[in-house]
Every structure is written in structure tokens, then in C-alpha cells.
């Protein structure tokens, strides 16, 4: 699987999940988020050669097409597959509020 366990331990040029840390205050200007100060959002990048974690028959065909026709612009894209939520803490006045935000952390990628 093209997940963090594999991708973070290997120098992989093809489609893989890459580490990306986002600081809420410095990177996004969201000064009101109390905890965490930031988190690893991660992102997907890298080429999608034939049969690399193909998500659908279409992406398999597209990958083969691109392999046999290298000059073609059509090829599968490296996109998030599994995402996890992130829990944040902020204050409404002096009242703490905890929210779980869905699909915030990329854990694995796929070619689609």
C-alpha cells in the first residue's frame, strides 16, 4: 500500500504520500485554533506508471495507454486514498470547544 508506513521509509519517486506539516497560525493565519498548533496534513505526489496502485479499470487502462504512448498527456493522477480526522480545540469566548474535522490527514495515496 502507498501509505505512510511505506512511503515515509522509502525514497519513492512514483506516486506516494509525502509528509507536509501545516502550522495553523503561521501557514494558514488561523490564530484562533488553540490545539494542536499544527499537524501533518501530508499530500500525494509522483507519477503513476502502469499498474501502480491503480484505483479503477479506467486508471489501469490509462496507465497502460501512457506507457505505450509516452508523448500523451493523459495519465492517472496520484490522489489521496485514505484520510483520517483531526481533533481541534478552540475557545468560544472562554468556553472550550472540541471538534473532530473529517478528512484532514492523508494516510495513503492511489493512482486514479
Amino acid at each position: 500500500a502507498l501509505d505512510t508506513n511505506y512511503c515515509f521509509r522509502n525514497l519513492e519517486e512514483n506516486c506516494c504520500v509525502r509528509p507536509l506539516y501545516i502550522d495553523f497560525r503561521q501557514d494558514l493565519g488561523w490564530k484562533w485554533v488553540h490545539e494542536p498548533k499544527g499537524y501533518y496534513a501530508n499530500f500525494c505526489s509522483g507519477p503513476c506508471p502502469y499498474l501502480r496502485s491503480a484505483d479503477t479499470t479506467h486508471s489501469t487502462v490509462l496507465g497502460l495507454y501512457n506507457t505505450l504512448n509516452p508523448e500523451a498527456s493523459a495519465s492517472p493522477c496520484c490522489v489521496p486514498q485514505d484520510l483520517e480526522p483531526l481533533t481541534i480545540l478552540y475557545y468560544v469566548g472562554r468556553t472550550p470547544k472540541v471538534e473532530q474535522l473529517s478528512n484532514m490527514v492523508v494516510k495513503s495515496c492511489k493512482c486514479s
Epitope: W32, Y91, G93, R94, T95, K97
Partner: antibody
Framework: EVQLVQSGAEVKKPGASVKVSCKTS????????MNWVRQAPGAGLDWMGQ????????NYNEMFEGRVTLTADTSTSTAYMELSSLRAGDIAVYYC??????????????WGQGTLVTVSS | DIVMTQTPPSLSVSPRETASISCRAS??????????MHWYLQKPGQSPQLLIY???NLESGVSDRFSGSGSGTDFTLRISRVEANDTGVYYC?????????FGQGTKLELK
Amino acid sequence: EVQLVQSGAEVKKPGASVKVSCKTSGYTFIKYWMNWVRQAPGAGLDWMGQIFPAWGSTNYNEMFEGRVTLTADTSTSTAYMELSSLRAGDIAVYYCARGYGNYALDAMDYWGQGTLVTVSS
Amino acid sequence: DIVMTQTPPSLSVSPRETASISCRASESVDSYGNSFMHWYLQKPGQSPQLLIYLASNLESGVSDRFSGSGSGTDFTLRISRVEANDTGVYYCQQNNEDPLTFGQGTKLELK
């Protein structure tokens, strides 16, 4: 230039609902909380609630008894306020206002021009 | 809810004089070293505009004739050398507690 442009005046019957829009431009919509404030004729300002457009988190003033619903469309940078079960006491000018940015509850540095909602049978 | 009481309800001032508006909160609006109190002016037929942020910080583009002071429960907005353009209703607002609340307003007019 930061701009908040609200939809036009509305006339509604008692018991109906009204939905007011607030189209923003000149800043990053998902970076700031959007507040809604109402002002009855000749009266002061009442905070109704707020929404964080990036993921739709909301905080409401309990005085509106769950009748208000705030939403946001990030594709058009537009915020919406819907008020249900309208009554005569809801006749007011409704404002959207951008939060200052340092806190969830905060001062409001840019305001829409206001939308007059009239309730009449 | 924190109740904000403004005095006086209305104020008539001669041009070039100084006007003072008070705002008293029903409980302290101070936290983490800040006073969570702000001031607005609503000119006739217009939307409110922010004048003072966090009790004493002048908002960008606002005349330095406006100044704010105070902490805890008692706050004051001062307008020096009052001009015709200063007429309208002034509101204080707190955000130290949910829900955010405003004062009832002080109407300033020129003599």
C-alpha cells in the same frame, strides 16, 4: 478591497422562512469567521451566530431558539443565514460581518450593507 | 450573558469639543492580559464600522481623534475635536464570553 454584498430586502409571511446571502470578495473566504448580526428598527445590535466556512463549524446565540441556520459555499465565497418560523419580532435589518481573525468570537472589521426583512400577513 | 450598559444614552456636543462615552460590563471582560472590548460607530443609514479593538487599539484608517481606555468592567471611548462626521450611534461590544453582546448604543449629535 474587502466587500460583503448582501441579497435584497425580503417580505415574508408569519411562520415562513427567509434565507439571506452574503457574497464576499477581496479576501480569503475560508480564513475568517463570518458573523450575523441583526438590528430591529430603532434598536441596538444582536449577535445571532457565526460560521467558519472552511469546514462549516458554527456557534449560535441561544436567544434565537434554534431558528437560525448558518451555511457557507466556499466555491462562491458566499455565506447564508436562514431564519425560520418568522414572527413580527423578527422585523429587522440583518448584517453579515467578518470576524477580525484573532479569536473565534471577535470584533467585526467588515460589514455587509444589511438586508431588511419584513414580516407581514 | 454579559450585559453591556452604555452611558449616556444620548449626547449633544459642540464642534471641536471632546465627547466621552462609557460602557460598563456586568462582569469582567478581561482574560489572558487582554480586555475583550471593542467600539463601533454606526452612521445614519450605514452599517456599523469598527473604531477601537481590544479596548484601546485604533483600527486601521480610523482618525486618531478616537481613543479607548479601561479594563475589567469599565471602559471609555473619547472623541476629541468632534466633527459633524462623527454623528451617529456608538456601540461597545464584548467577546470575552459566549454569546457576544453589544451595548444598547449612545447617540451622538452636534449642538
